[in-house]
């Protein structure tokens, strides 16, 4: 079952799916001046069996000015534009994608791919949020949103994440700014879809990246 809406937006935050549930579709979008090849797929589809999942179909783009089809080539790093919120950059991913049955990895880029990836998520999909550079989270723990089915309708849970800029902080004389201690982090509230391993990795990220302190949904 496809999720009706996109994951919720949070001010000054981006989200990313660390793995994609079977049934997820990714539109084959091309950058300006290019289009899908005539017989090309409209989308890639995450499919699989109990032991292995992968993306069916391949996206291929060709110049709008020519009739020739282009072969699918992975662009060089400098050619890869920053993608939209579903592709947030981080030094390590909170989930070992290969270890999640029924999920696909991030699809590799294709030549002349659009700068934004448009995914169609399915019920049960989880996305993780982090504050954009220059903003910090007011909460601690993993920030996630899950697409759930309730009373026959799909909805995304609201991630408990507030990202604030340093310039907004109000500190006054005599009010000392405490230092966040990386030690003794209490266990986050658990979610049925987050494993201990996920959270440990996320807290490691939090310790190394001020702007990527993930936070958990408040139930």
């Amino acid at each position: 079952e496809l999720c009706d809406d996109d994951p919720p937006e949070i001010p000054h935050a981006t989200f990313k799916a660390m793995a994609y549930k079977e049934g997820t579709m990714l539109n084959c979008e091309c950058k300006r001046g290019f289009r899908r090849i005539k017989s090309g797929s409209l989308y890639m589809l995450c499919t699989g069996n109990s032991s292995h999942s992968s993306w069916d179909n391949q996206c291929q783009c060709t110049s709008s000015a020519t009739r020739n089809t282009t072969k699918q080539v992975t662009p060089q790093p400098e050619e890869q534009k920053e993608r939209k919120t579903t592709e947030m950059q981080s030094p390590m991913q909170p989930v070992d994608q290969a270890s999640l049955p029924g999920h696909c990895r991030e699809p590799p880029p294709w030549e002349n791919e659009a700068t934004e990836r448009i995914y169609h998520f399915v019920v049960g999909q989880m996305v993780y949020y982090q504050c954009v550079q220059g903003y910090r989270a007011l909460h601690r723990g993993p920030a996630e949103s899950v697409c759930k089915m309730t009373h026959g309708k799909t909805r995304w849970t609201q991630p408990q994440l507030i990202c604030t800029g340093e310039m907004e902080t109000s500190q006054f004389p005599g009010e000392e700014k405490p230092q966040a201690s990386p030690e003794g982090r209490p266990e986050s509230e658990t979610s049925c879809l987050v494993t201990t391993t996920d959270f440990q990795i996320q807290t490691e990220m939090a310790a190394t990246m001020e702007t990527s302190i993930f936070t958990t949904e408040y139930q």
Partner: antibody, heavy 116, light 107 residues
């Protein structure tokens, strides 16, 4: 089940101080941002102050900046609001709240009356 | 600070009526808007977040729409328990700000 219980309200003269407390239970207090919201009698709602999970970031409404201080004691699961140089316009019910993005849990509120 | 202006400030309606309350922001707040319901002597209760997402447990007769600076809360068929004061609130930037409220009364 989340429970937030405010205390410390009362009648105070202009220019004096008061400290409000909010005892929290039913969730991992030290993981969550907390806030104070107030509502003057018969009036609307106003965010007063917000504090991050570890107390390292604090945000205040312009109307209370320099007079009010929000703080927390994670070991005691308690949120505080130190109110100095109180004015008549600070008269309100003060609510402690958390779950700032996902539905907000509120306390029952404590009434602060500033009057001579 | 971003000012939030609600209209009307009060309105009378009957059970079964369709009611619309509007909220205007002094500058764009994207879709970062909440709607609350408050009854006398009680803390506010959030009905809608992100302009149009229904809070869990809130009846589907409540809906929200809009973007940028203009937003609406609609109650499709008023029920007796819906008579209360409604507030919009932006969370695009601190300080978060509320509208002045709309008091919904029984006609």
């Amino acid at each position: 089940q989340v429970q937030l219980v405010e205390s410390g309200g009362g009648v105070v003269q202009p220019g004096r101080s008061l400290r409000l407390s909010c005892a929290a239970s039913g969730f991992t207090f030290s993981n969550h941002a907390m806030a104070w919201v107030r509502q003057a009698p018969g009036k609307g709602l106003e965010w007063v102050a917000v504090i991050s999970y570890d107390g390292s970031n604090k945000y205040y409404a312009d109307s209370v900046k320099g007079r009010f201080t929000i703080s927390r004691d994670n070991a005691k699961n308690t949120l505080y609001l130190q109110m100095n140089s109180l004015r008549a316009e600070d008269t309100a019910v003060y609510y402690c709240t958390t779950g700032l993005n996902s539905g907000y849990d509120w306390g029952q509120g404590t009434l602060v009356t500033v009057s001579s | 600070d971003i000012q939030m202006t609600q209209s009307p400030s009060s309105l009378s309606a009957s059970v079964g009526d369709r009611v619309t309350i509007t909220c205007r922001a002094s500058q764009s707040i994207n879709s970062f808007l909440n709607w609350y319901q408050q009854k006398p002597g009680k803390a506010p209760r959030r009905l809608i977040y992100g302009t149009n997402s229904l809070q869990s447990g809130v009846p589907s007769r409540f809906s929200g729409s809009g973007s940028g600076t203009d937003f609406t809360l609609t109650i499709s068929s008023l029920q007796p328990e819906d008579f209360a004061t409604y507030y919009c609130q932006q969370y695009n930037s601190w300080p978060w700000t509320f509208g002045q409220g709309t008091k919904l009364e029984i006609k």
